[in-house]
Interface confidence: medium
């Protein structure tokens, strides 16, 4: 789970081991504060629970890849 | 244990239509997408079509090939997936198999059915 | 849809390191699975995530991917792993693409 350090700066200590389909997430934010230990992708689900992620892992660049698509197609 | 039976094969007639079904069991089945996947005698395996999980409101997605006469469907009362197959060809002739799937669009196959065959000759 | 190409045949001796390739357009940014297929039997999956084995998959199986190119590779092959092997990776919305298959043979 992300954790606020002297907020407003929040840092990921622990990766998700799944992946999470990514009709099941909502938005992503990078978290590269050189306070942190790591980088980092937090996303927010579509139950609003935020989850942290590493980068370097296919299925989360797929899943920024995918949400960055989302946002750039106006809804009709 | 995970468990997925085929059943619906047999002998249809080009034109012709039929409904295979596949009986899930051993696992929360809404939880996980389902596809079908077929090998025609002697060659390699071809997917055909997918319904994802409730997580994607069981999205269908289908191969070019069967687009247009293939239906996927579920009934996760029944814990059981369907194809109807309209409009059969020659071309169509294959093993089908079920197999499940946990993640999109990362799908992968960790759990297959035996297949049931479906022959399209006149 | 991605296309993946394997080789047709490999042929290995027991205990030798049989090596069965998948190559594919910018391939290493997708993931990679592979599956083993023997006569009149269902597939099944022995490498997923380009590396990682399911559990009851022997540690001799093991699988890379990078650039345009995924291996399937099994260390000290058995007359048991005799088979045909698959490749697979995937596009979007749930659709799959499998490579054409190669049939191992071990002599």
């Known amino acids: 789970q992300p954790d606020a350090i002297n907020a407003p700066v929040t840092c990921c200590y622990n990766f998700t081991n799944r992946k999470i389909s990514v009709q099941r997430l909502a938005s992503y934010r990078r978290i590269t504060s050189s306070k942190c230990p790591k980088e980092a992708v937090i996303f927010k689900t579509i139950v609003a629970k935020e989850i942290c992620a590493d980068p370097k892992q296919k299925w989360v660049q797929d899943s920024m890849d995918h949400l960055d698509k989302q946002t750039q197609t106006p809804k009709t | 244990q995970v468990q997925l039976v085929e059943s619906g094969g047999g002998l249809v007639q080009p034109g012709g239509s039929l409904r295979l079904s596949c009986a899930a069991s051993?696992?929360?089945?809404?939880?996980?997408?389902m596809s079908w996947v077929r090998q025609a005698p002697g060659k390699g395996l071809e997917w055909v079509s997918s319904?994802?999980?409730?997580?994607?409101?069981?999205?269908?997605s289908y191969a070019a090939s069967v687009k247009g006469r293939f239906t996927i469907s579920r009934d996760n009362s029944k814990n059981t997936l369907y194809l109807q197959m309209n409009s059969l060809r020659a071309e169509d002739t294959a093993v089908y198999y079920c197999?499940?799937?946990?993640?999109?669009?990362?799908?992968?196959?960790?759990?297959w059915g035996q297949g049931t065959l479906v022959t399209v000759s006149s | 849809d991605i296309e993946l190409t394997q080789p047709p045949s490999v042929s290995v001796a027991p205990g030798q390191t049989a090596r069965i390739s998948c190559s594919g357009d910018?391939?290493?940014?997708?993931?990679v699975y592979w599956y083993q297929q023997k006569p009149g039997q269902a597939p099944v999956l022995v490498i997923y995530?380009?590396?990682n084995r399911p559990s009851g998959i022997p540690e001799r199986f093991s699988g890379s991917n990078s650039g345009n190119t995924a291996t399937l590779t099994i260390s000290g092959t058995q007359a048991e792993d005799e088979a045909d092997y698959y490749c697979?990776?995937?596009?979007?919305?749930?659709?799959?693409?499998f490579g054409g298959g190669t049939k191992l043979t071990v002599l």
């Open positions: 197999a499940r799937f946990e993640f999109t669009p990362w799908t992968y196959f960790d759990f």
């Open positions: 051993g696992f929360t089945f809404r939880s996980y997408g």
């Open positions: 319904i994802e999980h409730k997580w994607t409101n069981y999205a269908t």
């Open positions: 910018n391939l290493g940014k997708k993931y």
């Open positions: 995530d380009d590396d």
């Open positions: 697979q990776s995937y596009t979007a919305q749930s659709s799959a693409s």
